[in-house]
Each structure stands twice: as structure tokens, then as C-alpha cells.
């Protein structure tokens, strides 16, 4: 019987060009975590395997960093990064637990675009 629960950062927002940390935490189970997959929709971002360590998908290697912990850091965010992210915990003997995070990437503040008015 699967007794565990996944806590996530939930719905989060970040500015274009910035960074964000995606975090999930598995609790209320003594099951052993053998692997955590991070996915965006159906695309694999990264794997953290208990034996082999971290793998970052080739297409994300310049913008994704492992950690902290079992989390994932997304860098140089673009509006195209807006969407659902999933942390998939493979555990023994429980099986698979999945957490969901929704990220919204917002256009940067006025500061990035420069002042709109000249101060006399």
C-alpha cells in the first residue's frame, strides 16, 4: 500500500531571464527512493539515480543544474518555460509517486527595459 505523499512548491512564478528552483519532497513513507525523474510535459529534463547520480538531458544541459538535493534549478528562463513540471519518485517497494509544479515565466519588470521617462 502506498502511504507516502509528495509535497511540492506548487504554483510558482519567475521573471524571464531569471532562475527558479523546483523542489519536491516525499514524506510519510519508509520506501527507498531509487530514482527521481524531472519532466516537463512529456520531455525528460533530468534524472537523479541513487547509484549513478545526476543526468541532465542534452537539450537542457546549458540551462538546467542539479539540486539542491533532489530538486532542480532552471536558469535563463524564457516564456516558453511556462508550463507543468513533474517530479517522479521511483521507490521500493511502494512504486511511483508523482508531484506537479506549475511554473509561469513573466516578462521582466520595467527595470530590464530601461526607464520609460526622462527625469529633467
Amino acid at each position: 500500500m502506498m502511504t507516502g505523499t509528495i509535497e511540492t512548491t506548487g504554483n510558482i512564478s519567475a521573471e524571464k531571464g531569471g532562475s527558479i528552483i523546483l523542489q519536491c519532497h516525499l514524506s510519510s513513507t519508509t520506501a527507498q527512493v531509487t530514482q527521481v525523474n524531472w519532466e516537463q510535459q512529456d520531455q525528460l529534463l533530468a534524472i537523479c539515480n541513487a547509484d549513478l547520480g545526476w543526468h541532465i538531458s542534452p537539450s537542457f544541459k546549458d540551462r538546467v543544474a542539479p539540486g539542491p538535493g533532489l530538486g532542480l534549478t532552471l536558469q535563463s528562463l524564457t516564456v516558453n518555460d511556462t508550463g507543468e513540471y513533474f517530479c517522479i519518485y521511483h521507490t521500493y517497494p511502494d512504486g511511483t509517486y508523482t508531484g506537479r509544479i506549475f511554473l509561469e515565466v513573466l516578462e521582466s519588470s520595467v527595470a530590464e527595459h530601461g526607464a520609460r521617462f526622462q527625469i529633467p
Partner: nanobody, 116 residues
Framework: EVQLVESGGGLVQPGGSLRLSCAAS????????MGWFRQAPGKERELVAA????????VYADSVKGRFTISADNSKNTAYLQMNSLKPEDTAVYYC?????????WGQGTLVTVSS
């Protein structure tokens, strides 16, 4: 510079099998983990399977679990990918890499086409 040469691809019917080989001019491992990747037309290159240099641990993409088996022979500087129960969606160019994160050396790949 280490050369990687993949071979064993070809045309196979759905449900068929192929065994891919990856021969390296030096060690097949540049770190602790080597992997097989694939790239289908119009898609990003993705991990298929990986294996530790002690061969004690393996990882598989969910889409190939139970069908593909990765192995490595350090004495021959060669890695293998046994592919069974092939599906049309397995059609891609398959590459090996000496590290599953540092993509400095790629071979030319070997084309696998699954079609009836």
C-alpha cells in the same frame, strides 16, 4: 581524441530485435557512467539507457524499460544495446556517449528503422 563507432542498426519489422555495438578507440567510459542516446527526426536527442563502469547499475528510459538491455565490456572497450520487441516509435539514429552528461564525443550514429 577518442573515436566512437556505432554499428548494428538497420531495418527491422515491429516486434523484431537488433543488437547495437559501440566501439571506442580508448576507454568506453570517460567517467563513471556511459550511455546510449537516440534522436528521432525532428526531435531532441534523448537518453535511452546508461550503465555504470562496474556494470552494477543501469538506468533505462521509461519508453524502453523491459525491452532494451545495456551492457559494456571494458576489456574490449565496447558497449552494447540489445533491443527487443521493437516498435515503430523506436525509429531513430542511435548514439553512444562515454559519459551520460559530458557530450564531448559523439560517433556518427547508427540508424534503426522499425517498419513493416
Amino acid at each position: 581524441e577518442v573515436q566512437l563507432v556505432e554499428s548494428g542498426g538497420g531495418l527491422v519489422q515491429p516486434g523484431g530485435s537488433l543488437r547495437l555495438s559501440c566501439a571506442a578507440s580508448g576507454s568506453i567510459f570517460s567517467g563513471n557512467v556511459m550511455g546510449w542516446f537516440r534522436q528521432a527526426p525532428g526531435k531532441e536527442r534523448e537518453l535511452v539507457a546508461a550503465i555504470s563502469n562496474s556494470a552494477s547499475s543501469t538506468v533505462y528510459a521509461d519508453s524502453v524499460k523491459g525491452r532494451f538491455t545495456i551492457s559494456a565490456d571494458n576489456s574490449k572497450n565496447t558497449a552494447y544495446l540489445q533491443m527487443n520487441s521493437l516498435k515503430p516509435e523506436d525509429t531513430a539514429v542511435y548514439y553512444c556517449a562515454r559519459d551520460w552528461n559530458l557530450f564531448d564525443y559523439w560517433g556518427q550514429g547508427t540508424l534503426v528503422t522499425v517498419s513493416s
